[in-house]
C-alpha cells in the first residue's frame, strides 16, 4: 500500500464529549457465541499519533522481545525492524531468540516513496493485550529501509492484516492472522476502533493516551452505538468493498458508480486520508468548496499541503459539509450509508508557530489506485473485519469526534439497483491472458 500518504492516526484523548454519546439501539442481530460481548483485556490496546499510525504491543521470540507494531489492514506482511536505525528505539534481535528459524529467503517491498527489505524467518509471537495465545508466524526481519520508519512514531514494525494474495514475496507466505486462526481457537475476525483525538498530541500525551482498540476474534459492544451494517468483501486480497453512491451534504455527486471504485475501493487502517480516484476527488472537492463557500480557501489547502487555522475553540465546523458513502449491502438491491463529519476529514496538525490555535490539513486526497478508506473514515466508526463471513461491518464509534449539532452515522437500508455494475474489473495480466 502506498507509503508516504499512508499511515494514520490521531489518538483518543478526546472522543465524544460527555452527554454526546448516542443511545444504543436494540434491533441488533442475535448473539453469536464466542464472537460478541466483552473483550476487556483488548479494549484500549492501541496507541498512536496523528498521521503516524495506530500501533499495538506485540512480543516476538524466546525470551519475548516487546515491540510496538503498526496495525495495517492494507498489507499482508508481518515485518519488524531487525537492525539499528536512527528512528528505532529498539529492534528485533533474532540472535537472542532460541525459537527463531531462518527461512533463508529475502523479501523486498518498494512503495511509491521509500521501501523496506529484509530476511524471512519464523518465530513465536503473541499480543500481550490480545488473545492469550502464542503462534509461530512468518516474520520479515527488516535489515534495510528508506522512508519507512517515522521519526517519533514509536512503532518498530508493521502487522499486515490483509490476505495472502498481496503478501510479499508471494501468496505462499502465510500472513499473521491466517497463522493465528489456524493454530488457535480464535475466531476468524477482528474489529478496529480507531479514535481520533480531534487535536494534535505531543509525544508524552501520545504515550499516556488511548488510541483505540483492536479486538481479535470478536466484537465488543461497548465500542459502538446503534447497529452494525455489513458490506461484502468483494475479493480477498485487500479488504475490497463496493461504493455505490457518494453524497456531500445530502447532494448526490451523480457519477457513474464505477468511478467510485476505479480501480478498487479498500478499507486501510495504514492510510491517513480518505483517498479518492482523480475524477471523484475533483467532483467531491468542487462540491465541498460550494458547500463551504462562506470562506474561500486556497488551492494549497484542498491539495492537503496548506494549513488552515482558527484561534482556539473557534473552528466553524458548521460551514463544512458531511460526506456520505453508500456501500453495497448484504441483501440484493440494498445499500447502507456511512456519514463522516469535518471533524474526521480535517486532520488536526501542530505547527511551532500555532501552538495556541487549532490547525488542520484537508485529509481527502487524490489517488491513482482507487478509493482508500483510511483513518479519516475509520475514525468515525467501529469496523468489523468479519473474514469468516467475507464481510465488513460498520457502526458509529463510541469514541468519534463530533459536536453538539452533528454526529457520524451509519444508516439503512436504501434501495439501490444494479450495484454489481459498480465494481471495476481489473484487467488480468497473467500469462494465460497474454496468450489469448
Amino acid at each position: 500500500t502506498q507509503h508516504g500518504i499512508r499511515l494514520p492516526l490521531r489518538s483518543g484523548l478526546g472522543g465524544a464529549p460527555l452527554g454526546l454519546r448516542l443511545p444504543r439501539e436494540t434491533d441488533e442481530e442475535p448473539e453469536e457465541p464466542g464472537r460478541r460481548g466483552s473483550f476487556v483485556e483488548m479494549v484500549d490496546n492501541l496507541r498512536g499519533k496523528s498521521g503516524q499510525g495506530y500501533y499495538v504491543e506485540m512480543t516476538v521470540g524466546s525470551p519475548p522481545q516487546t515491540l510496538n507494531i503498526l496495525v495495517d489492514t492494507g498489507s499482508s506482511n508481518f515485518a519488524v525492524g531487525a537492525a539499528p536505525h536512527p528512528f528505532l528505539h529498539r529492534y528485533y534481535q533474532r540472535q537472542l531468540s532460541s525459537t527463531y528459524r531462518d527461512l533463508r529467503k529475502g523479501v523486498y517491498v518498494p512503495y511509491t516513496q521509500g521501501k523496506w527489505e529484509g530476511e524471512l524467518g519464523t518465530d513465536l509471537v503473541s499480543i500481550p493485550h490480545g488473545p492469550n495465545v502464542t503462534v509461530r508466524a512468518n516474520i520479515a526481519a527488516i535489515t534495510e529501509s528508506d522512508k519507512f520508519f517515522i521519526n517519533g512514531s514509536n512503532w518498530e514494525g508493521i502487522l499486515g492484516l490483509a490476505y495472502a494474495e498481496i503478501a510479499r514475496p508471494d501468496d505462499s507466505l502465510e500472513p499473521f492472522f491466517d497463522s493465528l486462526v489456524k493454530q488457535t481457537h480464535v475466531p476468524n475476525l477482528f474489529s478496529l476502533q480507531l479514535c481520533g483525538a480531534g487535536f494534535p498530541l505531543n509525544q508524552s500525551e501520545v504515550l499516556a493516551s488511548v488510541g483505540g482498540s483492536m479486538i481479535i476474534g470478536g466484537i465488543d459492544h461497548s465500542l459502538y452505538t446503534g447497529s452494525l451494517w455489513y458490506t461484502p468483501i468483494r475479493r480477498e486480497w485487500y479488504y475490497e468493498v463496493i461504493i455505490v453512491r457518494v453524497e456531500i451534504n445530502g447532494q448526490d455527486l451523480k457519477m457513474d458508480c464505477k468511478e467510485y471504485n476505479y480501480d478498487k475501493s479498500i478499507v486501510d487502517s495504514g492510510t491517513t486520508n480518505l483517498r479518492l480516484p482523480k475524477k471523484v476527488f475533483e467532483a467531491a472537492v468542487k462540491s465541498i468548496k460550494a458547500a463551504s463557500s462562506t470562506e474561500k480557501f486556497p488551492d494549497g489547502f484542498w491539495l492537503g499541503e496548506q494549513l488552515v487555522c482558527w484561534q482556539a475553540g473557534t473552528t466553524p465546523w458548521n460551514i463544512f459539509p458531511v460526506i456520505s458513502l453508500y456501500l453495497m449491502g448484504e441483501v440484493t438491491n440494498q445499500s447502507f450509508r456511512i456519514t463522516i463529519l469535518p471533524q474526521q476529514y480535517l486532520r488536526p496538525v501542530e505547527d511551532v508557530a500555532t501552538s495556541q490555535d487549532d490547525c488542520y490539513k484537508f485529509a481527502i486526497s487524490q489517488s491513482s489506485t482507487g478509493t482508500v478508506m483510511g483513518a479519516v473514515i475509520m475514525e468515525g466508526f467501529y469496523v468489523v473485519f468479519d473474514r469468516a463471513r467475507k464481510r465488513i461491518g460498520f457502526a458509529v464509534s463510541a469514541c468519534h469526534v463530533h459536536d453538539e449539532f452533528r454526529t457520524a452515522a451509519v444508516e439503512g437500508p436504501f434501495v439501490t439497483l444494479d450495484m454489481e455494475d459498480c465494481g471495476y474489473n481489473i484487467p488480468q495480466t497473467d500469462e494465460s491472458t497474454l496468450m489469448t
Epitope: 489547502f301 496548506q306 488552515v308 487555522c309 482558527w310 505547527d351 508557530a353
Partner: nanobody, 120 residues
C-alpha cells in the same frame, strides 16, 4: 497562495550584524502576524521574534536586547535586525506569516529559509 521571500542571510563574524528581510506577495487578506523562526539540523524550529500588524512584538529570551523585529505594513514586509551575533545564532532562519481570512481564521505560510552563519 501567499509567497514569502527571505533575503539578507550570509556569513558574518561573531559580534557582527545582519539584517534579514521577508516580503510577502500573492493573495493577501490580512497579515496580522509575521515572525522569524530558526532551525539548526536535528533540532525543532524555534521562535526568534514575532510582530503583529499593530507593532506589538515578542522575542525569544536568547535574542532579547540584540535582535529587533520590525515591519512595513504597506509593503507586507518584515525585517529582523540582528546585532552582536554569536556562533550559537548560526541556523536557517525562516519567515512566517498568518494570513487572516476572517476574525479568527487564518492560513499559515512559511518561507524557504535563509542561512545565517556566525563564525568565531
Amino acid at each position: 497562495q501567499v509567497q514569502l521571500q527571505e533575503s539578507g542571510g550570509g556569513l558574518v563574524q561573531a559580534g557582527g550584524s545582519l539584517r534579514l528581510s521577508c516580503a510577502a506577495s500573492g493573495r493577501i487578506f490580512d497579515l496580522r502576524d509575521m515572525g522569524w523562526y530558526r532551525q539548526v539540523p536535528g533540532k525543532q524550529r524555534e521562535l526568534v521574534a514575532a510582530i503583529t500588524s499593530g507593532g506589538t512584538s515578542n522575542y525569544a529570551d536568547s535574542v532579547k536586547g540584540r535582535f529587533t523585529i520590525s515591519r512595513d505594513n504597506a509593503k507586507n514586509t518584515v525585517y529582523l535586525q540582528m546585532n552582536s551575533l554569536k556562533p550559537e545564532d548560526t541556523a536557517v532562519y525562516y519567515c512566517n506569516a498568518k494570513n487572516f481570512f476572517s476574525a479568527s481564521g487564518y492560513f499559515l505560510y512559511w518561507g524557504k529559509g535563509t542561512q545565517v552563519t556566525v563564525s568565531s
